[in-house]
């Protein structure tokens, strides 16, 4: 799996999208989990509605919400009031029985608010100093990193 980097700004909301094949994952609930260590488990943060037909309903755990467009094949996770400790390595998962398939590996980065300047010095724009030349900028900056592009820490 490639890893997609999503950057958000402290105090703001960050929306993470995980596209998937709606036919392949038909009838499956989804989940958002956080990888706790290089070799550690992926700890469940929030999952979609227990009834798959109601997956479009937003479910929340603290400041994290999840909703699933099962027809369009897009799982959406919203992190509200982003804080530095929200930074981390996450996964979107498709659940079947006690198993879970990884839909997308996600790296969340939380940046300092660039607009919170007390002096009107050098205006800093998100992504300006980052190595995200092909970044897609919306409310967040996201970029897919190819497996071989940067060596990822081994997970086994």
């Amino acid at each position: 799996h490639n890893t997609t980097v999503f950057q958000g700004v402290e105090g703001q909301s960050l929306q993470v999208s995980c596209p998937y094949d709606s036919m392949k994952h038909w009838g499956r609930r989804k989940a958002w989990c956080r990888q706790l260590g290089e070799k550690g488990p992926c700890q469940r943060v929030v999952s979609t509605h227990n009834l798959w037909l109601l997956s479009f309903l937003r479910r929340r755990n603290g400041s994290t919400a999840i909703t699933d467009d099962t027809l369009g094949g897009t799982l959406t996770i919203t992190l509200r009031n982003l804080q530095p400790h929200d930074a981390g390595f996450y996964q979107c998962q498709s659940l079947h029985g006690s198993e879970a398939d990884t839909l997308r590996k996600v790296l969340v980065e939380v940046l300092a608010d660039p607009l919170d300047h007390r002096d009107a010095g050098d205006l800093w724009v998100p992504g300006e100093s980052e190595s995200f030349e092909d970044a897609h900028v919306e409310h967040s900056i996201s970029r897919s990193l190819l497996e071989g592009e940067i060596p990822f820490p081994p997970t086994s």
Epitope: T3, G37, A87, A112, P153, P154
Partner: antibody, heavy 121, light 107 residues
Framework: QVQLVQSGAEVKKPGASVKVSCKAS????????IHWVRQAPGLGLEWMGW????????TSAQKFQGRVTMTRDTSISSAYMELSRLRSDDTAVYYC??????????????WGQGTTVTVSS | DIQMTQSPSSLSASVGDRVTITCRAS??????LAWFQQKPGKAPKSLIY???SLQSGVPSKFSGSGSGTDFTLTISSLQPEDFATYYC?????????FGPGTKVDIK
């Protein structure tokens, strides 16, 4: 064991730039953020910012934005901090420190030995 | 920015003493607090993270407690190698800020 080794002392003139390096060993470099912290003579510690070696993403304290550039070279497990438009009050010991969280911000656990930067005309 | 204050700013103690240093944040930081020890001419050494978790290799005579705005670092029985300056740091909100330090010296 986990180790961060920094480059040697530097003497710079006001207006110049300085680039400090931090070479990591003993762990997977791309799995842990690197923070930069400085300490002026006789004073306390001041956080400058971090770089995520996996993605190259950075953030910095507002007082340094536009003047600090943090980069990394994953092929040699090294992080760099460049500070431009140096002033005399930038004279300090500059430290790199590894965050203990896996691609996360959980507080630093290992520090480099420090690099003394003196800014003087 | 979150201001971190430490008290006392300095203290004199004897070997074997129990020493307590307090750190206060200007706003709530949950448990996102770390403690460091620094000796003259040396880099800081990480002692505690998440307010009360001991870093690997740090002796159990060091302990941390607190949550929200008030935190303490306790050294249960001061040893000669513990005379140093101690700093707290919050990593809840940018910019991550340090306390001004508490210098522990020999009585």
């Amino acid at each position: 064991q986990v180790q961060l080794v920094q480059s040697g002392a530097e003497v710079k003139k006001p207006g110049a730039s300085v680039k400090v390096s931090c070479k990591a060993s003993g762990y997977t470099f791309t799995g842990y953020y690197i923070h930069w912290v400085r300490q002026a003579p006789g004073l306390g510690l001041e956080w400058m910012g971090w770089i995520n070696p996996y993605s190259g993403g950075t953030t910095s304290a507002q007082k340094f934005q536009g003047r600090v550039t943090m980069t990394r070279d994953t092929s040699i497990s090294s992080a760099y901090m460049e500070l431009s438009r140096l002033r005399s009050d930038d004279t300090a010991v500059y430290y790199c420190a590894r965050d203990g969280g896996y691609l996360a911000l959980y507080g630093t656990d290992v520090w480099g030995q420090g690099t003394t930067v003196t800014v003087s005309s | 920015d979150i201001q971190m204050t430490q008290s006392p700013s300095s203290l004199s103690a004897s070997v074997g003493d129990r020493v307590t240093i307090t750190c206060r944040a200007s706003q709530g930081i949950s448990n996102y607090l770390a403690w460091f020890q620094q000796k003259p001419g040396k880099a800081p050494k990480s002692l505690i993270y998440a307010a009360s978790s001991l870093q690997s290799g740090v002796p159990s005579k060091f302990s941390g407690s607190g949550s929200g705005t008030d935190f303490t670092l306790t050294i249960s029985s001061l040893q000669p190698e513990d005379f140093a300056t101690y700093y707290c740091q919050q990593y809840s909100t940018y910019p991550f800020t340090f306390g001004p330090g508490t210098k522990v010296d020999i009585k």
